[in-house]
Every structure is written in structure tokens, then in C-alpha cells.
């Protein structure tokens, strides 16, 4: 059940998109933590990739996640939830040949091998926030973002644009 | 059609008070950021303020010529901003334009056409 | 604060030049990977417009002409064939942190 064929097949894409290109404008390896400095790591068991929240321990080496920036671009005319313009949407690559996928159904971040061109689940609108944090907004559904839920990634549903701020969505990228 | 329409400049004396508001429309307002940025007659644009998204207080800033006498706030019930100044002074004289953060917060993408602020006695 | 230093603070030019604006900031405006450097133009009583984003990027319904580059603290806007309507007076400004800060501009006349 790991692979491509068990992406699922979501049609509802955010704010009818398209993403200009169909390669990134830039790329940036970073390490990934939450709002409360636990580690974003990515575990291989059983011949798939597991993601983890967890503390590491000190000098403990972070795992690194390769963020390709791409353009998308929002026509307000064709947009059903008035949202327009330009954004900034990202794919993140643990390692070779996988990125994070949102299971919509599940309402769960899993890691799915795949080949180019990725599906709309392996894309998020990024949010630069403030406390110098960003979010992960799914294209396939907007106002769903990556967040931590028992000590996994998830996917949480945001009910109002004022609650983007909770710390559960919000993550830090550092290069360190 | 996405816009922003500013209102409420005018005329006023050293240590006055005006209210700006910026009227947005064709876009869900409760999603972006807004920002106010002047520009003195044939001067450069300078920021001012920006109002962000939050569920307990909306979190606020502002550049240091103006903290302590300018205060932005906003109703998303009625899509607009709002830029609230006391104790004006001759060097607040500009146009105060209103701007939307594109969606994600990046930069500063939509711009209203502006509103005159004239302080002098 | 991050201060923006805009050259030339003006410049002549002829219909069809290539046309190149700097912008240096006083520290990097890098973050996430993104340079968070911005380009407006300006025209006589009107609002700015935004031109390039993200230092290269173009805004919406900007033209192939105008292009942006750079990462740090140095950055660059060309015009690669300067028409009539771009004479203008352009603005550099980054977005990394507040205050936000715009260089003092660039006027660009016919010669």
C-alpha cells in the first residue's frame, strides 16, 4: 500500500491553482521543528518512512528536509473562496524519491515515493508567520495545514483565519 | 475585482487627530495582512503599520516615528482597516496608502490609490 | 533595523536601453531560503505597483522586460528594453522583518 497508487485522488484543488512551471524557483535544505523545539524526524521501518515529533537529545543530529519553492498563481475570478494573487507553494523531500503527502482522508502527513510530476497532495501553500514560523497549507484543501497531533505530523483543519496563529501549525526551518 | 479604497484624510492642525479607513473588497479580507505606508510630497514611501491574524489579540506593529501615536486596527465583519492617529504632526504630512499582503504573507501586493493627510496650522 | 540603498538616485534614458537599478541592503534579507526583496514602480500621483517579488519573481501582469536578481544583500532589477511607459521612479523594499524599509528610489526619465 506504499507508492503512488495509494495517494489518493482528490480533485478539489486549493483555489482551482496552477502552479507556474513545473520547475521550482529555488531550493532549500533545512531542518524542521515545531513551535516548541521538538524535532520533525523521518525513521525507516518495514521498507516505508515513518515521521516523528520527538526532543532530540543534545548534539543529536537534526534530519534534514529539502522545501522546493514553487510559484502558483490565483486568478481572484476563477478563486471560490477569495483568495487571489500570487503564493509561494512548497514539496518537502526527506530524502530521495519521497515527499510528504497530505492524506486527506485519513487526515494524516504520510511519506510516498513517487515520481515527477508530483500529485496536488505533495504541494503546500507556505505561510511565512510571525515568531519567524511558517505553516503548511494543503493545496488539495485549503484551510487544512500540517500540525502536531500526539506526537505525529497531521493534517488540522483551521476554522477561521484567525486561529492561524495556533502553535500546533506552526514550524521552524533552520539550516542548522 | 480585488480593491482597496482609503478614506478619511484631510486637513488638520499640530496635535489633531484623524482616522483612516480602507474599504476592502473582491477578496476574503479575514485572510491577509494589511499594512499602511505614506509617502511625503516628492519623498520616498515609508511603512507605518501592519495588522496581522490572531485568535486571542491581533498582533500589531508599527515603525518607531509613529508608536505610541498611531494605532491600526481592523473589523473583518466589515472588511476594513483602519489607521487611527493622534497627536499629529507637520511630518505626518503624506499620502497613507493602504496594502494587502499577498496570501502567505510574503510581500506587499495590492495597493489602494492612497488618501491626503495635510497637518499644518 | 535593515536600511535599503537604492542606486542611481536617478537616471536618463532612451527608449529601448537596457536599463539596471541596484539595491544593497545593510544585512541579509535571506530567510527560509527566500530573499525577501521587492521591486515597486511608481508613476506621477498613483499608487506603487508592485513589479518583482522574492527578488526574482514577477508580479501579475508585469512584463518579460523586467526581471530581478539577487540574493543577501545585493540585489538587481532589470529593464531589459526600456518602453515609454516605464519611465517611472522605482522602489526597492524587503519584507523580511519589521520595520519593512524601501530604498529612496530611483527615477527613471527620458534622455
Known amino acids: 500500500a506504499f507508492g503512488i497508487s495509494g495517494v489518493q485522488k482528490y480533485t478539489r484543488a486549493l483555489h482551482d491553482s496552477s502552479i507556474t512551471g513545473i520547475s521550482p524557483i529555488t531550493e532549500y535544505l533545512a531542518s524542521l521543528s515545531t513551535y516548541n523545539d521538538q524535532s520533525i524526524t523521518f525513521a525507516l521501518e518495514d521498507e516505508s518512512y515513518e515521521i516523528y515529533v520527538e526532543d532530540l537529545k543534545k548534539d543529536e543530529k537534526k534530519d534534514k528536509v529539502l522545501l522546493s519553492y514553487y510559484e502558483s498563481q490565483h486568478p481572484s475570478n476563477e478563486s471560490g473562496d477569495g483568495v487571489d494573487g500570487k503564493m509561494l507553494m512548497v514539496t518537502l523531500s526527506p530524502t530521495k524519491d519521497f515527499w510528504l503527502h497530505a492524506n486527506n482522508k485519513e487526515h494524516s502527513v504520510e511519506l510516498h515515493k513517487c515520481e515527477k510530476p508530483l500529485p496536488d497532495q505533495a504541494f503546500f501553500v507556505l505561510h511565512n508567520m510571525h515568531s519567524n514560523c511558517v505553516s503548511f497549507e494543503c493545496k488539495t484543501d485549503p484551510g487544512v495545514f500540517i500540525g502536531v497531533k500526539d506526537n505525529h505530523l497531521a493534517l488540522i483543519k483551521v476554522d477561521s483565519s484567525e486561529n492561524l496563529c495556533t502553535e500546533n501549525i506552526l514550524f521552524k526551518l533552520s539550516e542548522t | 475585482e480585488v480593491q482597496l479604497v482609503e478614506s478619511g484624510g484631510g486637513l488638520v492642525q499640530p496635535g489633531g487627530s484623524l482616522r483612516l479607513s480602507c474599504a476592502a473588497s473582491g477578496f476574503t479580507f479575514n485572510k491577509f495582512w494589511m499594512n499602511w505606508v505614506r509617502q511625503a510630497p516628492g519623498k520616498g514611501l515609508e511603512w507605518v503599520a501592519e495588522?496581522?491574524?490572531?485568535?486571542?489579540?491581533?498582533?500589531?506593529d508599527y515603525a518607531e516615528s509613529v508608536k505610541g501615536r498611531f494605532t491600526i486596527s481592523r473589523d473583518n465583519a466589515k472588511n476594513s482597516v483602519y489607521l487611527q492617529m493622534n497627536s499629529l504632526r507637520a511630518e505626518d504630512t503624506a499620502v497613507y496608502y493602504c496594502?494587502?499582503?499577498?496570501?502567505?504573507?510574503?510581500?506587499?501586493?495590492?495597493w489602494g490609490q492612497g488618501t491626503l493627510v495635510t497637518v499644518s496650522s | 533595523d535593515i536600511q535599503m540603498t537604492q542606486s542611481p538616485s536617478s537616471l536618463s534614458a532612451s527608449v529601448g536601453d537596457r536599463v539596471t537599478i541596484t539595491c544593497r541592503a545593510s544585512?541579509?534579507?535571506?530567510?527560509?531560503?527566500?530573499?525577501?526583496m521587492n521591486w515597486f514602480q511608481q508613476k506621477p500621483g498613483k499608487a506603487p505597483k508592485l513589479l518583482i517579488y522574492?527578488?526574482?519573481n514577477q508580479g501579475s501582469g508585469v512584463p518579460s522586460r523586467f526581471s530581478g536578481s539577487g540574493s543577501g544583500t545585493d540585489f538587481t532589477l532589470t529593464i531589459s528594453s526600456l518602453q515609454p511607459e516605464d519611465f517611472a521612479t522605482y522602489y526597492c523594499?524587503?519584507?523580511?522583518?519589521?520595520?519593512?524599509?524601501f530604498g529612496q528610489g530611483t527615477k527613471v526619465e527620458i534622455k
Open positions: 544585512e541579509s534579507v535571506d530567510r527560509y531560503g527566500i530573499s525577501f
Open positions: 522574492a527578488a526574482s
Open positions: 496594502i494587502r499582503r499577498n496570501y502567505g504573507n510574503w510581500f506587499f501586493e495590492i
Open positions: 495588522i496581522r491574524l490572531s485568535s486571542i489579540n491581533y498582533v500589531k
Open positions: 523594499q524587503h519584507s523580511k522583518e519589521v520595520p519593512y524599509t
